[in-house]
Amino acid sequence: EEELQVIQPDKSVLVAAGETATLRCTATSLIPVGPIQWFRGAGPGRELIYNQKEGHFPRVTTVSDLTKRNNMDFSIRIGNITPADAGTYYCVKFRKGSPDDVEFKSGAGTELSVRAKPSAPVVSGPAARATPQHTVSFTCESHGFSPRDITLKWFKNGNELSDFQTNVDPVGESVSYSIHSTAKVVLTREDVHSQVICEVAHVTLQGDPLRGTANLSETIRVPPTLEVTQQPVRAENQVNVTCQVRKFYPQRLQLTWLENGNVSRTETASTVTENKDGTYNWMSWLLVNVSAHRDDVKLTCQVEHDGQPAVSKSHDLKVSAHPKEQGSNTAAENTGSNERNIY
């Protein structure tokens, strides 16, 4: 009489995470009497996956009704597959023994590989803002994918970047993998509206890569340029001095007027105008009563932008009987600020 053989026809099975894996196994004989068990791995540390005889295996169902007398199909289904389920599964026939059943014959094994999608890439930029011409680093991370092969690309405004380094961990065999990439980006003054994109392509994504983005508006700081100008007003004893704050980002800005070094007014940028490149302009006016001064006045526009050290621009106001226009304001976007007279 031919000896029982345990047949596992599939050398390998590939299943997407979340789906059900079918592991096939048939015996060639009903004899010897005894149960079938499924294990993951071989040797003393093997993990019991299913025992026909006893136990509770909520994720496992049998393909056939094992209580039927002539059943020789011991295939199983494992539901809700995760990358942790990857491994080689063995269908093992036991023969009844005293007091314990004895392993009789094992199948050749079926390797279960799990295809798991990478998580959505998360792009993070530097902790502190940087100014144009500086190089900043962005990182991109994605986790939980299998198999290990993966492609990562960086883009800035649709243009592919080349200065980046990528690592896939772990280096050896694992149930799932993670990717970590760092890209270097040189900032320009026009980058307020720019985006950095990390794109991950994997076999599980069927040609539709995942993308993570970072807005450079959260990374860049464009320092303002200052221009102080003076023009006459209708009242002969008053002079209008304007401080034009141009091309700054972000909006957080505080302006202080100094008169001969003494603080005369401090205000915070509120009603700003936005340029096409995403930077802002703002203008502050100071109305100076010339008659209150016998000597020339040094007016200083001091700006503290985004918590950085203050920058300033000064203007010497000549006190004379007939003040002349000493500069013109050509900025079309001026919105002005609170008008205050200094007496």
Epitope: E1, L30, L66, T67
Partner: antibody, heavy 131, light 103 residues
Amino acid sequence: AVTLDESGGGLQTPGGALSLVCKASGFTFNSYNMGWVRQAPGKGLEFVAGIYSAGGDTSTTYGAAVNGRATISRDNGQSTVRLQLNNLRAEDTGIYFCAKAAGGCTAHNCDAYIADSIDAWGHGTEVIVSS
Amino acid sequence: AVTQPASVSANLGETVKITCSGDSSYYGWYQQKAPGSAPVTLIYDNDKRPSNIPSRFSGSKSGSTATLTITGVQADDEAVYYCGNEDMNYVGIFGAGTTLTVL
């Protein structure tokens, strides 16, 4: 007619061994699964051991209470099935019935098991384990 | 494990059903009129009846529950009824028995 005659019962001492024999007639013995069922005083039926028609030690099965102490065997030429029970205990006391299944099991086909398909019983032999 | 009711009762001539539940595909039903006496097979393989058993005894199985039906119960039917099956380890199991009382 199918007849099953048990023998070998009687008074046994604890720790000893007994050998029960069932002599079958009236059917093609080697085509059928055979088994032993017992009944302790005041208790229900209990499966003791079974042997499939395929024969050999690879086609035997034992109840939990006797597993490791019992051996069932068959002699198709003599149409007998034997139950050997070692290390006897007081709880082995009872009537031991020989049972014939309605079919047999070969390597590739099983018409019957035992407890779900007994179609003939012997009259039983009484075993008393006592010192 | 096999579960069956400890006792059932029926009036003479009535139909009585005894159930047995367990994790198996096949069940047998055995009648024992006195403790220690040889059991009699009423039904094997769920619904097969030996030729010497009256047709008022019938067996059926639905899902994991087997049922022995006795139609037109007679006084002589008073006995203990056992169901038997095989567990997943090919070991025979018998229920604890159901005592039928005919009123």
